[in-house]
Interface confidence: low
């Protein structure tokens, strides 16, 4: 449906607030170097503008896109060149080549530093003061540190910190209130931000289609009752609301979720039985809900899935006649009947019944050919359950920290090109795995397992596609989408690297270790066990577990000691001595 | 996008007849099998009958043998279901759906047989 004015259309859709928040997230995950100050001058000028075209759809500029508006206004920023070097350069092209040169330039790594948490009495009485740019402050520094971050769930964020504030700096202990609230937060937020981040990487690496199949497959899942043709319609809505979003669409986006949810809402009966109270919510909390509600029950009595795609004569006609559409029905009714198969493995097993078709009907016997297609869903069935039983048993044998440390060794003699901040972020979020998925039944641990993992992997690929060092990455992340993960199992130890130089430097440690939260600590013993195993590959487990028990008694012991820096000079020494005959450096 | 739009229920007395029709659009309607279902007040769903894409092949629930029969222009893109001898226990809504799905997407259309 056609407007006058996009921008007058949106923003009375959405509501100043919304409108002034979403521009806001989106200049922000363009631009983002510059500083809040600036980027709030500009929301600011774009929201009278808005007002403008409200009053009049008619006035000067207002029949302009979304995307024009806003890239003209970033446009304007005067340090473009000095700050950007050459984004500044999209300014001179036209949209949409101008928008997706932006896009182009967004950073999952930006060069920002790391958000320090003030004291409590500081930030409560930073939201008093002035509560409005204290939540502008946070979508601000969230959406340029998270440039791909999903904009409307954002908002839901925003509304989660407000509620926290407003709760705990009435409390009489703010801090006990507040803090568990902040790094749940945190904690969720980083999360979401890769589970988008995998979505927009999915739909611009992989295409529309890829999407598309990932949808069909999880929405079977979550909703097994409904029909195929509701299924499909729920995908394409879905397709187009991430597609805008992951596109820097977000007014748009916003407005499109916020349809569906309604949709999603109106035909409950026809869906799902579990909606019920994610329906009673106000929109934020209601889009989140849905998003994230359980699967619902099964319809009892399913036929088998062998006689419309194995044994009936018509497999090969309905398939050429309609190639999509009965693959997207396979994928539906395989998917519904299994909410304990990981998405990514109903789609490899779709991919291997679409390879059969393919093969088989320009064969001399069709049917024949594809008789045993079930036959080869077997072992892509249980690769994922074993490797998922072993590393469950490590978990529970580990724990957390050690299961983490044994990831790390395991990818580092993988892909030993990767630089240690990456390898440590991944494999800590790899070894998380344990704690998120090995406590649920067998029924529940795959698709809770191997769909972490193809997020994880993905923040392996992106962070990697920025500056590529290692071939075997580009490969498992380019190949397929959906056979990452067992590409980077089935990895061996790299024959062809070549250990880095020893260098004393690296291990060497001061006494602010000790002041470390107990997580920073472990970040700090895991970054020297990565270049411990990048100077020494073929360290064994034995070794290299030696080497960490005597750095942590090290530390245990230089934090405990009345001069620091002198036991952490002294004793230092002696550590990386020991270690390099221990480990023949 | 996938849609389907039944129509042609209404209140018949016993021993009466109607003939539903479900208008596919949004896909290859002549290359798949569809069915119909039925879903009465209070009840689960209900599988009704069954074609398949050509048209040759019929399946009918033992409660509708003999009395429903199931058919489908392709070219028109349209399903159709001729129920006669109808009975108060035949009250539902009733929905077409792809291939032999009890799930209910598309919204029905709703047969009441009563004297």
């Known amino acids: 449906d056609a407007h006058k004015s996009e921008v007058a259309h949106r923003f009375k859709d959405l509501g100043e607030e919304n409108f002034k928040a979403l521009v806001l997230i989106a200049f922000a995950q363009y631009l983002q170097q510059c500083p809040f100050e600036d980027h709030v001058k500009l929301v600011n000028e774009v929201t009278e503008f808005a007002k403008t075209c409200v009053a009049d759809e008619s006035a000067e500029n207002c029949d302009k896109s979304l995307h024009t508006l806003f890239g003209d206004k970033l446009c304007t920023v005067a340090t473009l060149r000095e700050t950007y070097g050459e984004m500044a350069d999209c300014c001179a092209k036209q949209e949409p080549e101008r928008n997706e040169c932006f896009l182009q330039h967004k950073d999952d790594n930006p060069n920002l530093p790391r958000l320090v948490r003030p004291e409590v009495d500081v930030m409560c009485t930073a939201f008093h003061d002035n509560e409005e740019t204290f939540l502008k402050k946070y979508l601000y520094e969230i959406a340029r540190r998270h440039p791909y971050f999903y904009a409307p769930e954002l908002l839901f964020f925003a509304k989660r910190y407000k509620a926290a504030f407003t709760e705990c700096c009435q409390a009489a202990d703010k801090a006990a209130c507040l803090l568990p609230k902040l790094d749940e937060l945190r904690d969720e937020g980083k999360a979401s931000s890769a589970k988008q981040r995998l979505k927009c990487a999915s739909l611009q690496k992989f295409g529309e289609r890829a999407f598309k199949a990932w949808a069909v497959a999880r929405l079977s899942q979550r909703f097994p009752k409904a029909e195929f043709a509701e299924v499909s319609k729920l995908v394409t809505d879905l397709t187009k609301v991430h597609t805008e979003c992951c596109h820097g669409d977000l007014l748009e986006c916003a407005d499109d979720r916020a349809d569906l949810a309604k949709y999603i809402c109106e035909n409950q009966d026809s869906i799902s039985s579990k909606l019920k109270e994610c329906c009673e919510k106000p929109l934020l909390e209601k889009s989140h809900c849905i998003a994230e509600v359980e699967n619902d029950e099964m319809p009892a009595d399913l036929p088998s899935l062998a006689a419309d795609f194995v044994e009936s004569k018509d497999v090969c006609k309905n398939y050429a006649e309609a190639k999509d559409v009965f693959l997207g029905m396979f994928l539906y009714e395989y998917a519904r009947r299994h909410p304990d198969y990981s998405v990514v493995l109903l789609l490899r097993l779709a991919k291997t019944y679409e390879t059969t078709l393919e093969k088989c009907c320009a064969a001399a016997d069709p049917h024949e050919c594809y008789a045993k297609v079930f036959d080869e869903f077997k072992p892509l069935v249980e690769e994922p359950q074993n490797l998922i039983k072993q590393n469950c048993e490590l978990f529970e044998q580990l724990g957390e920290y050690k299961f983490q440390n044994a990831l790390l060794v395991r990818y580092t003699k993988k892909v030993p090109q990767v630089s240690t901040p990456t390898l440590v972020e991944v494999s800590r979020n790899l070894g998380k795995v344990g704690s998120k998925c090995c406590k649920h039944p067998e029924a529940k641990r795959m698709p809770c397992a191997e769909d972490y993992l193809s997020v994880v992997l993905n923040q392996l690929c992106v962070l990697h596609e920025k500056t590529p060092v290692s071939d075997r990455v580009t490969k498992c992340c380019t190949e397929s989408l959906v056979n990452r993960r067992p590409c980077f199992s089935a990895l061996e130890v790299d024959e062809t690297y070549v250990p880095k130089e020893f260098n004393a430097e690296t291990f060497t440690f001061h006494a602010d270790i000790c002041t470390l939260s107990e997580k920073e600590r472990q970040i700090k013993k895991q970054t020297a066990l990565v270049e411990l195993v990048k100077h020494k590959p073929k360290a064994t487990k034995e070794q290299l577990k030696a080497v960490m028990d005597d750095f942590a008694a090290f530390v245990e012991k230089c934090c405990k000691a009345d001069d620091k820096e002198t036991c952490f000079a002294e004793e230092g020494k002696k550590l990386v001595a020991a270690s390099q005959a221990a480990l023949g450096l | 996008q996938v849609q389907l739009v039944e129509s042609g229920g209404g209140l018949v007395q016993p021993g009466g007849s109607l003939r539903l029709s479900c208008a596919a659009s949004?896909?290859?309607?002549?290359?798949?099998?569809m069915s119909w279902v039925r879903q009465a007040p209070g009840k689960g769903p209900e599988w009704v009958s069954a074609i398949d894409s050509g048209g040759a092949d019929t399946r009918y629930a033992e409660t509708v043998k003999g009395r429903f029969t199931i058919s489908r222009d392709n070219a028109k893109k349209t399903l159709y279901l001729q129920m006669n001898s109808l009975k108060p226990e035949d009250t539902a809504v009733y929905y077409c759906?792809?291939?032999?799905?009890?799930?209910?997407g598309s919204q029905g259309t709703q047969v009441t047989v009563s004297s």
């Open positions: 759906t792809i291939g032999r799905s009890t799930s209910r």
């Open positions: 949004g896909f290859s309607f002549g290359s798949f099998g």
